[in-house]
Amino acid sequence: MMTGTIETTGNISAEKGGSIILQCHLSSTTAQVTQVNWEQQDQLLAICNADLGWHISPSFKDRVAPGPGLGLTLQSLTVNDTGEYFCIYHTYPDGTYTGRIFLEVLESSVAEHGARFQIPLLGAMAATLVVICTAVIVVVALTRKKKALRIHSVEGDLRRKSAGQEEWSPSAPSPPGSCVQAEAAPAGLCGEQRGEDCAELHDYFNVLSYRSLGNCSFFTETG
């Protein structure tokens, strides 16, 4: 039975001429990830094979970079890059899991216009949250004087998008050469370089088992 879920960055937008990171994570399964394919419709963008490393399609070699993690960085974006992107996890024994990301590439002026309205809006939202949180803290402190209260700040909540697929919002993209992992330790890739190793790492916490910086490793997780 396939128990895993794919967490993705969901619907994203980027500016023409800029770059974007496409990210997926597989969680809630103990299946072994053998390969991850990145596709745009029927066009292959890249593959990361657990034994053989990265293969970037010749059609995209000049503007696709592997990583960070199992993700893919799309550079020099054009309006024609707008559309659906798929991450396909090949696993054993589960089979394949597919995640979907919709990318919209905006003209520079549109993106800037959007940003001008977004920044004050975000500021207002943040201020409102601060007021609400302060009120809650005061109320709780008054009612539970003797109990210590730990407030957990959760950045990048996962919200169910559809069966077997979730949206994932990374708080900040990790740089190439580092491990990208969500708290539940979904399957990921470490410090990859094109053509280098994506060898499976059975022990997620055994950081010392990385052979060298620049190797990329699949993680088997028990999320």
Partner: antibody, heavy 120, light 107 residues
Framework: EVQLQESGPGLVKPSETLSLTCAVS????????WNWIRQPPGKGLEWIGY???????YYNPSLKSRVTISRDTSKNQFSLKLSSVTAADTAVYYC??????????????WGQGTTVTVSS | DIVMTQTPLSLSVTPGQPASISCRAS??????IAWYQQKPGQSPKLLIY???YRYTGVPDRFSGSGSGTDFTLKISRVEAEDVGVYYC?????????FGGGTKVEIK
């Protein structure tokens, strides 16, 4: 120029183990990946498996229980062992090189092949 | 495993005329297709990778196209030296699998 040369006994008895070696010259086996493929008489190609530059192996599930691919980097060669052979294993066996980074799973340097007959 | 089906099984072509070989995958394989030529008594040689990219030294009369499940190898003007068996291969997922082959003969 990279050259691959298969070698091994041309005749193997049923139930025995077929052993072949592929000698690689003009290139170090510490990069790329190295495949075995076979072709029964008058038939098509069947991919057996590979060994990667790091020594990791993958075998065709249809043969997995009987196949072992290993390498000797000091001699710049890799080997195929196929156990419990039957007449159905009679074929021309090829070794081939792949560069996953540039060509994915396409194999671009092939040996000339060696014929193995399984018969008592 | 992904099954690759080639058509036709054999093809007889007049020199200078075009030839077309089809390959169909049992499931979508994006553009992860290679084509090989095997001349009589020789080992296979890579012609095309990533569905449409000619390998080094391959004459430009050979071209590949397609994505998803349907792929085509075309020879724009067949020459006598093109006789042999042509195979498609997928590397979308392991195990890599080959088509059954198409035999090209000269009329």
């Amino acid at each position: 120029e990279v050259q691959l040369q298969e070698s091994g006994p041309g005749l193997v008895k049923p139930s025995e183990t077929l052993s072949l070696t592929c000698a690689v010259s003009g290139y170090s086996m510490t990069s790329d990946y190295w495949n075995w493929i076979r072709q029964p008489p008058g038939k098509g190609l069947e991919w057996i498996g590979y060994i990667s530059y790091s020594g990791r192996t993958y075998y065709n599930p249809s043969l997995k229980s009987r196949v072992t691919i290993s390498r000797d980097t000091s001699k710049n060669q890799f080997s195929l062992k196929l156990s419990s052979v039957t007449a159905a294993d009679t074929a021309v066996y090829y070794c081939a090189r792949g560069d996953y980074s540039n060509y994915g799973g396409a194999m671009y340097d092939w040996g000339q092949g060696t014929t193995v007959t399984v018969s008592s | 495993d992904i099954v690759m089906t080639q058509t036709p099984l054999s093809l007889s072509v007049t020199p200078g005329q075009p030839a077309s070989i089809s390959c169909r995958a049992s499931q979508g394989v994006s553009t992860t297709i290679a084509w090989y030529q095997q001349k009589p008594g020789q080992s296979p040689k890579l012609l095309i990778y990533s569905a449409s990219y000619r390998y080094t030294g391959v004459p430009d009369r050979f071209s590949g196209s397609g994505s998803g499940t349907d792929f085509t190898l075309k020879i724009s003007r067949v020459e006598a030296e093109d006789v042999g068996v042509y195979y498609c291969q997928q590397y979308y997922s392991s195990p890599f699998t080959f088509g059954g082959g198409t035999k090209v003969e000269i009329k």
